[in-house]
Interface confidence: low
């Protein structure tokens, strides 16, 4: 009963987590304009993995996709890749775990097969969660780096040298959604792995008891699982979305006259 509950709860938690990862990936508010120095601004800029938006005080919002692929920074591409890999692994994990659920009977599926499937889906959820957490963390690291690098810069404006302060971007809602969702998926995966230990065929348990009466009965021992994000901290001063293909009908995020779309 406890195994079924653990497995079911792991599935539900992972499902919520993966839904959150999908939501975070699609959200536009990965980075939002820092309003610390300008709280009453008429225009508010925010950016996602796929497009950049501006919202006017009237409530009018306009978004534009990043029309270039090659021009986008490698780190942004890496974040996109991590999130997509997380979603794909999570989706496959969900599919596998549905068939692995103890409460669902599919033909004459062996308990050992269910145990293996539960473990497989659990590992997939763990990797999916780690991908999402890594992706969000890499993006957050880019933001932190750029935030402190955004000091006053000189550039030529309409006819003369103009002193401007670059817009600073801070953490958007999508980052928090991504972290929480990745964490939930990770927890769900761990729960699935734990549940798989109690899903071994019953005769194995009896044999374990009869042959090792004085010892602990261990029905199923999954191999050790070690996951690593493989990402170090990004210390390069790399502006987000720099070097994108610019078009003549783009106007820029506050306060630069050049948009990175």
């Amino acid at each position: 009963m406890a195994v079924t509950a653990c497995q079911g709860l792991g599935f539900v938690v992972s499902l919520i987590g993966i839904a959150g990862i999908i939501a975070a990936t699609c959200m536009d508010q990965w980075s939002t304009q820092d309003l610390y120095n300008n709280p009453v601004t008429a225009v508010f800029n925010y950016q996602g993995l796929w497009r950049s938006c501006v919202r006017e005080s009237s409530g009018f919002t306009e978004c534009r996709g990043y029309f270039t692929l090659l021009g986008l920074p490698a780190m942004l591409q890496a974040v996109r890749a991590l999130m997509i890999v997380g979603i794909v692994l999570g989706a496959i994990g969900l599919l596998v775990s549905i068939f692995a659920l103890k409460c669902i009977r599919i033909g004459s599926m062996e308990d050992s097969a269910k145990a293996n499937m539960t473990l497989t889906s659990g590992i997939m959820f763990i990797v999916s969660g780690l991908c999402a957490i890594a992706g969000v963390s890499v993006f957050a690291n880019m933001l932190v780096t750029n935030f402190w690098m955004s000091t006053a810069n000189m550039y030529t404006g309409m006819g003369g040298m103009v002193q401007t302060v670059q817009t600073r971007y801070t953490f958007g809602a999508a980052l928090f959604v991504g972290w929480v969702a990745g964490g939930l998926t990770l927890i769900g995966g761990v729960m699935m792995c734990i549940a798989c230990r109690g899903l071994a065929p019953e005769e194995t348990n009896y044999k374990a008891v009869s042959y090792h009466a004085s010892g602990h009965s261990v029905a199923y021992k999954p191999g050790g699982f070690k996951a690593s994000t493989g990402f170090g901290s990004n210390t390069k001063n790399k502006k987000i979305y720099d070097g994108g293909a610019r078009t003549e009908d783009e106007v820029q995020s506050y306060p630069s006259k050049h948009d990175y779309v």
Epitope: E248, Y254, P255, K257
Partner: antibody, heavy 118, light 112 residues
């Protein structure tokens, strides 16, 4: 809300210059691209020039090349349009208009009437 | 330069009736980014112009839904479903696909 406030009416002699100002409030001038448009009495709109974010420079309409200069002073949030060698045909209402982010003409100044008369 | 041609130049309409203005460009307004930068401006008597429609069919904030834009490539239309007294003025189409920006000659909408 973004507001553009232009300087008052001007009366000039032929051959003189006029400098029209356009003060931006509610947002930082450097975030906007400023366009200048004029409208002669009873006529349509005519684009004079403005900032092109792709090239990072101000583009002037061929008709006004060499006679018009567009500048901005970010410390005061004011854009300027100076038209020299005025002729009677330059009598018009001069407007500043912004292009904010993705599209043109979001906000307009109230217009500055310039009369060129001897 | 892209030439914008509007028809009709004058449109007398009855209050509550629909009105339609056409705009044709001398070349396609489809930008390399896939967008079509065609806007419609309204200029009421004694006032500066204001943005009504941008990117062919998107209404700017505060614009009543009786205004709609349509078209593609080189042919565009502004429609007013039911003309109201406050709609009197001159309407301009303008392209934002390339520099220099160019305007149509304007269409005067007046009440019969």
């Amino acid at each position: 809300q973004v507001q553009l406030v232009q300087s008052g009416a001007e009366v000039k002699r032929p051959g003189a210059s006029v400098k029209v100002s356009c003060r931006v409030s509610g947002y930082t001038l450097t975030a906007l691209s400023m366009y200048w448009v004029r409208q002669a009495p009873g006529k349509g709109l005519e684009w004079m020039g403005g900032f092109d974010p792709e090239d990072g420079e101000t583009i002037y309409a061929q008709k006004f090349q060499g006679r018009v200069t567009m500048t901005e002073d970010t410390s005061t949030g004011t854009a300027y349009m100076e038209l020299s060698s005025l002729k009677s045909e330059d009598t018009a209402v001069y407007y500043c208009a912004t292009r904010l982010r993705y599209f043109d003409w979001n906000y307009w100044g109230q217009g500055t009437p310039v009369t060129v008369s001897s | 330069d892209i030439v914008m041609t509007q028809t009709p130049l004058s449109s007398p309409v009855t209050l509550g009736q629909p009105a339609s203005i056409s705009c044709r460009s001398s070349q396609s307004l489809v930008h390399s980014d896939g967008n079509t930068y065609l806007s419609w401006l309204q200029q009421r008597p004694g006032q500066p112009p204001r943005l009504l429609i941008y990117k062919v069919s998107k209404r700017f904030s505060g614009v009543p839904d009786r205004f709609s834009g349509s078209g593609a490539g080189t042919d565009f239309t502004l429609k007013i479903s039911r003309v109201e007294a406050e709609d009197v003025g001159v309407y301009y189409c303008t392209q934002g696909t390339q520099f220099p920006r160019t305007f149509g000659q304007g269409t005067k909408v007046e009440i019969k």
